[in-house]
């Protein structure tokens, strides 16, 4: 559950994501079928650069509705190709 994920991230708060935690997050996201808004909100609360650690291909599968709550600082470390994917989604999210 999302509460279990939050508890796990709380234990690791302030520390870099370990390979084990990364694997658990990936499995959790895959299990939900997509990176939904609640999950993304949780991940960026603990790992502000989470979106910028995904490839443009991975970002393309993130639904625009999930991007709505993303803060500018969450995109600080993204490169232009990642932003090329995220900006149209953000525009769509705000239009809706």
């Amino acid at each position: 559950s999302l509460e279990t994920l939050k508890a796990l991230l709380e234990v690791n708060k302030g520390h870099e994501m370990s390979p084990q935690v990364a694997t658990l997050i990936d499995r959790f996201v895959k299990g939900r079928g997509q990176l939904d808004k609640d999950t993304l909100d949780t991940l960026t609360a603990f790992y502000p650069g989470y979106l910028c650690s995904l490839s443009p291909e991975e970002l393309s599968s993130v639904p625009p509705s999930s991007i709505w709550a993303v803060r500018p600082q969450d995109l600080d470390t993204c490169d232009p190709r990642q932003l090329d994917v995220l900006y149209p989604k953000a525009r769509l999210a705000f239009q809706n």
């Epitope: 390979p19 997050i25 502000p48 650069g49 650690s53 490839s55 991975e58």
Partner: nanobody, 115 residues
Framework: QVQLVESGGGLVQAGGSLRLSCAAS????????MRWYRQAQGKQREWVAS???????SYSDPVQGRFTISRDNARNTVYLQMNSLRPADTAVYYC?????????WGQGTQVTVSS
């Protein structure tokens, strides 16, 4: 603590090639993106290329088709193969390691392309 050390820069004639290396030491992380940036004298730092955790790559328009980014996970090293170099490629090249939490930078290596 993460340390990034770039090497491989130097002076090369236009049309020549160089291979830059960036060796990362320190902790290992779950998801990382390795990026190369460059900064020419008096200009802003600009993004050059990225290699993502998935293994996919992307490039800025000025270097697309000429530069290739790759990595050797066993050696914790990322490379930038630069072919068909132009005077406009002259800059200090920086390696960047991005995680979901932080961003780490190397000290840079100078690349000078003479005409």
């Amino acid at each position: 603590q993460v340390q990034l050390v770039e090497s491989g820069g130097g002076l090369v004639q236009a049309g020549g090639s160089l291979r830059l290396s960036c060796a990362a030491s320190g902790s290992t992380f779950g998801r990382i993106v390795m990026r190369w940036y460059r900064q020419a004298q008096g200009k802003q730092r600009e993004w050059v290329a990225s290699i993502y955790d998935s293994g996919s790559t992307s490039y800025s328009d000025p270097v697309q088709g000429r530069f290739t980014i790759s990595r050797d996970n066993a050696r914790n090293t990322v490379y930038l193969q630069m072919n068909s170099l132009r005077p406009a490629d002259t800059a200090v090249y920086y390696c960047n390691l991005g995680t979901a939490l932080s961003s780490y930078w190397g000290q840079g290596t100078q690349v000078t392309v003479s005409s």
